[in-house]
Interface confidence: low
């Protein structure tokens, strides 16, 4: 159906299309329409698409009108559920999508004589698809402006742009489906086909021999069976046979006959011949036994001299009979061969719950503790075993005994100490039970038989130096006068503990304070500040490496302070003209002895070893397969005797080769059939058997006959910056950095300004393994001293 809804109307002057007023006359002064407003209603005409709209002609898609819905101006956007402003044009044809719409606003004259008058009209040609969404249109020219919205919606079960695709969900004989948003049928679970009326059979159901009317079913054709109708039904009565097609009976090995029920190998199936008889198959289900000497019968079951084999056990005597033999058993034994012990415990002769043990031609009773005798009929004297522990006497009773306990004991055997602890002990004391008595163990601070007394710990006047004693439970507390401390006020307070003085100053304890005696270079209450000597003591530049200053700490009254410009690895040497040079320790060079001499310059490490520079020394990290201070020794890879089965071992670099004998193969002459196994190639290499040898294809980073040598590739080109040494590490590398550099690839400059080397507020400038001090005004020298 096509729906149109009027949203708003604006006819400010209340005029008609022809310029007249809806209500008749105009005001002579301002020429505005007077009297009542327009009584506005709308007419709609919907027809086929016209590129040039003609007002006349039939409304081929339908027409309609609203009742009077307002005056000159109104807004219906907010009024929901009001159908007065809505026109619905149903259509019973496929919606063509394109259309022409004529909307007219009319004034109702209310009296029948005067015809209704048109206020304004709008036309719109366009295209619209069925949707729940509204499309808003406006008429903004002429005397009145109005706004409306339109939409096309399909009836229930109709879909598509033309509302002409029908889909109604169903679940019956004719189909089992729902409809998607486009009107397509979506089959319910277990159904298929364009109408969803074909059941999906059980998964695996034979398409040839099975079918179904309901989902998940699998109904077999005549002659077939099984969950999936894939097993044929053999001929009825088929015993030891199978079928490939229905009603066959194909015999298994050693079976014959129409129903495969005739045993062709009766001897093998049943082994009927006894006593070593030889069996022969004589026909289906037939056999014959050839008996050894001394035996006869169809199955060699008859012993002709039966007693020869001593068949009677347990000293039974044997008599030959027509059927074989008969045994006469000795007392206590029974059975055809006297091998069954007669049960002398049936019936049980043991009294008072005794357990009967069957013996040969007799029995034995295992009696409960209270009874004795052959059949447990005698009362045992339990007192003989001395069961009473803490008793005056033991009395024997029938099937029992009685212990007369000593005071403080109880229980059948007088072995339970009566608990005399019944809450007598006070103040959380613990009670120890004694025999016919108890003892209270008092917690600290309490005394008395029942721990009822609080001990006064202040009675001995323990507080020293005028301290006041306070008695508490199991303790006392001393309240000390000023200047004393300790649990007994015995300590004159030591303000030097812990030592507050810094930089090695000595601490002196006073009555209520401490004093720090500072070394020459420091000052302050705790000797924590570096003294500016030149502010307090005149100092004299001796040379470009040394200054002298007055001091009480040296015999000659002068202290010499050396410059630390040459760092930790050199000594400053003064030169004329205020210059200096540095005398470097072994292994160091450079203006400030800051450079470690490269001891690796002569390439001392052989056979691909990597040289790591030390201080006045070096160290070789050898390639795989080499060892020694200079990597000069090839490691003997044959030392573990890896070659099996007489193979001869030849040492290679980080590898060995086995010269195999007598048809043995493989890396270690361990195989008869293959040159390769998973151990042949190392480090993930792939082994190829080439008949009389093997070949390893190595992954990246490895080479050698068995992928045992790490390629230098991880160090090429050298990833280590600033002269760092690269060491191969499998498929990776490690950088050993030169002094002054750090980080995984030696790219970070070490902070040579840590800790602060510049004195007197000088600023430190960090270089590559060196620093420079920029001094504050009034100070000079390499470290601004």
């Amino acid at each position: 159906q096509f729906e149109l809804e009027i949203l708003s109307m604006q006819n400010v002057n209340g005029e008609l299309q022809n310029g007249n007023c809806c209500g008749g006359a105009r005001n002579p002064g301002d020429r505005k329409c007077t009297r009542d407003e327009c009584d506005t209603y709308f007419k709609v005409c919907l027809k086929e698409y016209q590129s040039r709209v003609t007002a006349g002609g039939p409304c081929s898609f339908g027409s309609g009108s609203t009742p009077v819905i307002g005056g000159n101006t109104f807004n219906l956007k907010a009024s929901r559920g009001n159908d007065r402003n809505r026109i619905v044009l149903p259509f019973s044809f496929a919606w063509p999508r394109s259309y022409t719409l004529l909307v007219e606003a009319w004034d109702s004259s209310n009296d029948t004589v005067q015809p209704d008058s048109i206020i304004e009209k709008a036309s719109h040609s366009g295209m619209i698809n069925p949707s729940r969404q509204w499309q808003t249109l406006k008429q903004n020219t002429g005397v009145a402006h109005f706004e409306y919205q339109i939409r096309v919606t399909c009836d229930d079960y109709y879909y598509g742009f033309g509302c002409n695709k029908f889909c109604r969900p169903r679940d019956d004989f004719f189909g089992h489906y729902a409809c998607d948003q486009n009107g397509n049928k979506t089959c319910m679970e277990g159904w298929m086909g364009p109408e969803c009326n074909r059941a999906i059979c059980r998964q695996g159901c034979s398409p040839k021999h099975g079918s179904c009317k309901l989902p998940g079913d699998c109904r077999c054709q005549y002659g077939w069976q099984g969950l999936y109708c894939d097993k044929c039904i053999p001929h009825p009565g088929c015993v030891h046979g199978i079928c490939n097609e229905p009603w066959q009976c194909l015999c298994e090995t050693n079976w014959g006959g129409q129903l495969c029920d005739k045993d062709l190998n009766y001897c093998g199936t049943h082994q009927p011949c006894l006593n070593g008889g030889t069996c022969s198959n004589t026909g289906p289900d037939k056999y014959q036994c050839s008996c050894p000497e001394g035996y006869s019968g169809p199955n060699c079951e008859i012993a002709e001299h039966a007693c020869l084999s001593d068949p009677c056990h347990n000293r039974g005597s044997c008599k030959e009979t027509s059927l074989g033999f008969e045994c006469e058993c000795s007392p206590g034994w029974t059975g055809p061969t006297c091998s069954t012990n007669i049960d002398d415990c049936s019936p049980n002769n043991c009294s008072h719950g005794g357990t009967c043990q069957d013996l040969v031609n007799g029995f034995k009773c295992v009696c409960p503790p209270q009874w004795t005798g052959k059949t447990c009929q005698l009362d045992a004297n339990e007192c003989e075993a001395k069961p009473c522990v803490n008793a005056k006497s033991c009395k024997n009773l029938i099937a029992s005994y009685y212990c007369d306990c000593l005071p403080g004991w109880m229980g059948q055997n007088c072995d339970i100490n009566i608990n005399d602890c019944l809450g007598q002990c006070q103040n959380d004391a613990s009670c120890r039970d004694l025999v016919n008595g108890y003892r209270c163990i008092c917690p600290p601070g309490y005394a008395g038989d029942h721990c009822e007394r609080d001990i006064d710990e202040c009675a001995s006047n323990p507080c020293l130096n005028g301290g006041h004693c306070q008695n508490e439970i199991n303790r006392f507390q001393c309240l000390c006068p000023t200047g004393f401390s300790g649990n007994l006020c015995q300590l004159d307070i030591d303000y030097c503990e812990p030592n507050p003085c810094q930089n090695g100053a000595q601490c002196y304890n006073r009555a209520s304070d401490y004093f720090c005696k500072c070394p020459e270079d420091y000052e302050g209450k705790n000797c924590s500040h570096l003294k500016d000597h030149c502010r307090t003591t005149p100092c004299e530049v001796i040379d470009s490496c040394t200054v002298a200053m007055a001091s009480n700490d040296t015999p000659e009254g002068v202290r010499y302070i050396s410059s630390n410009v040459c760092g930790p690895h050199g000594k400053c040497k003064s030169q004329s003209g205020g210059k200096f040079t540095c005398d470097c320790n072994k292994g160091f060079t450079g203006t400030y002895c800051h450079e470690n001499i490269n001891d690796c310059e002569s390439n001392p490490c052989r056979n691909g070893g990597t040289c790591i520079d030390g201080v006045n020394s070096y160290k070789c990290i050898c390639s795989d397969g080499w060892e020694g201070a200079y990597c000069e020794t090839n490691i003997n890879d044959c030392s573990q005797n890896p070659c099996h089965n007489g193979g001869t071992c030849r040492d290679l670099v980080n590898d060995f080769y086995c010269d195999c004998k007598n048809g043995w193969k493989g890396k270690t002459c361990h195989s008869r059939d293959s040159q390769c196994d998973e151990a042949t190639c190392n480090n993930g290499g792939t082994c190829y058997d080439e008949g009389d040898a093997f070949k390893c294809m190595c992954p990246g980073g490895w080479e050698g006959t068995t992928c045992n040598i790490a390629r230098n590739s991880s160090c090429l080109p050298n990833p280590c910056h600033n002269g760092g040494t690269c060491v191969v590490n499998g498929e990776s590398f490690t950088c050993v950095c030169k002094e002054g550099w750090e980080g995984p690839i030696c790219a970070q400059n070490t902070n040579d300004c840590s800790p602060h080397p510049c004195y007197n507020s000088g600023t430190c400038v960090d270089g590559d393994n060196w620093y420079r001090c920029e001094c504050a005004p009034g100070f000079a020298g390499p470290d601004c001293r």
């Epitope: 493989g666 361990h670 195989s671 008869r672 059939d673 998973e678 190392n682 480090n683 792939t686």
Partner: antibody, heavy 120, light 108 residues
Amino acid sequence: QVQLQESGPGLVKPSETLSLTCTVSGGSVSSGGDYWSWIRQPPGKGLEWIGYIYYTGSTNYNPSLKSRVTISVDTFKHQFSVNLTSVTAADTAVYYCARSGVAMARFDYWGQGTLVTVSS
Amino acid sequence: SSELTQDPAVSVALGQTVRITCQGDSLRTYYASWYQQKPGQAPVLVIYGKNIRPSGIPDRFSASRSGNTAALTITGAQAEDEADYYCNSRDSSGDHVIFGGGTKVTVL
């Protein structure tokens, strides 16, 4: 198809010697490149390799059992055996015999196992 | 050290993928073999070498190795895959055989 079958007593007293035999059918213990192993599994625990023998008589044992174990082969009977001396309750286990190829640690055929309990 | 380490237990939803790992120094040199053991039965070899399945073992079982770690992956686990799984290899010396402690796989 190679088949292996263990046999021997199911109960052994502490301090005595445990002896088991494995019979090989459908194949030969003398075939080159085959190692014949004993493996055990205590109840509710994992597998432990005891040792192997090659048809030439060469053996290799688990270092933790080496002082107590001996494995021997009888190529004519198609059998190989294990002896474990001075047993304790800790030796209670299901004992399996198994075959591996040249890879030595790849057991492709196993016996069904026999439970040996050490108890007095 | 000549040890192989396995997680004691893992669980997997039916049809999902589970990965069992085995760690040890010897695996840098030797491939692991993997065994499936169901209660009351002898172990069964399921995979060995680089990624080789004996006949009769479904292709949902696969193996891989990286560094000192071997892994057994079951893609699309089935109810019948619920079992204990053991890895083993030669030890680092190449002379002895070692087993992992086993991983119990539960299929939910």
